[in-house]
């Protein structure tokens, strides 16, 4: 699958704003912003 | 390739209880808030839970129509989310789907009947 | 909770006119930071939604752009400039402000 979110716009990707009385910061926890990052997930300890 | 793709839909009687697994893959899942959403047979789209990442103390929100009845979780070992539901009413007959909100499975098959 | 409501719930087009779905929130989806929290998908025939348009205007990757989104706080429209084979589904929009989290009803769009 191609990545559905436009790259050149992804700094605020997901931010919903307010919920409850506080602020859900999607952009920073998206599918599409976690490709970008480029993180790698630590592997299970075994 | 981003997959995530939904397992455990089945037919169940009124009351019972099952369990979905979402296995994600292709992205780095542990810092991801993930949601299930479900599709009513009249195909209305309805949002359920939401899970958040570790560092948010895997805070968890449901709709009204589920609270207290379905459980969200997730195993970032697995990179997967469940949704375990119990009291299963024969509303929550529909296609059940796990989603970023940007990328979203294949759906699974959830129908509640006697 | 935030209500969405979508007009026209059904749309037949000739392939190559241009079609508009309204959506109409009964809140303000104006967000922190100007962020208007409104979204559009669609979804074919057989499949899962697929994000066309994200804070009400702005085009997801992969999407052609024929397609665009327009609004104020409350009231939106997507737009399809020059209706193809592929468009064909079901449009929904949806918001991400406000839990619960709440979709239109869906616009069905047919060809003619």
């Known amino acids: 699958l191609a990545d559905p979110l436009d790259h050149r716009d992804a700094g605020d990707l997901w931010f919903p704003g307010e919920s409850e009385s506080f602020e859900d910061a999607h952009v920073e926890h998206s599918i599409s912003r976690s490709l970008l990052e480029g993180e790698i997930p630590f592997p299970p300890t075994s | 390739e981003v997959q995530l793709v939904e397992t455990g839909g089945s037919l169940v009687q009124p009351g019972k209880s099952l369990k979905l697994t979402c296995a994600t893959s292709?992205?780095?899942?542990?810092?991801?808030?993930m949601h299930w959403v479900r599709q009513s047979p009249e195909k209305q789209l309805e949002w359920i839970a939401h899970?958040?990442?570790?560092?948010?103390?895997?805070?968890?929100y449901y709709a009204e129509s589920v609270k207290g009845r379905f459980t969200i979780s997730r195993d970032d070992s697995k990179t997967s989310i469940y949704l375990q539901m119990n009291s299963l009413k024969e509303d929550d007959t529909a296609i059940y789907y796990c989603t970023g909100l940007d990328y979203w499975g294949q759906g699974v098959m959830v129908t509640v009947s006697s | 909770d935030t209500v969405l409501t979508q007009a026209p719930l059904s749309l037949s087009v000739t392939p190559g006119e241009s079609a508009s779905i309204s959506c109409r929130s009964s809140?303000?989806?104006?967000?922190?930071?100007?962020?208007?929290?409104l979204y559009w998908y669609l979804q074919k025939p057989g499949k899962s939604p697929q994000l066309l348009i994200y804070r009400m205007s702005n085009l997801a990757s992969g999407v052609p752009d024929r397609f665009s989104g327009s609004g104020s706080e409350t009231d939106f429209t997507l737009k399809i400039s020059e209706v193809e084979t592929e468009d064909v589904g079901v449009y929904y929009c949806?918001?991400?402000?406000?839990?619960?989290?709440?979709f239109g009803p869906g616009t069905k769009l047919e060809l003619k």
């Open positions: 809140k303000s989806l104006l967000g922190v930071r100007d962020i208007t929290s």
């Open positions: 292709g992205f780095p899942f542990s810092n991801v808030w």
């Open positions: 899970i958040k990442a570790k560092s948010d103390n895997y805070a968890t």
């Open positions: 949806a918001q991400f402000l406000r839990y619960p989290y709440t």
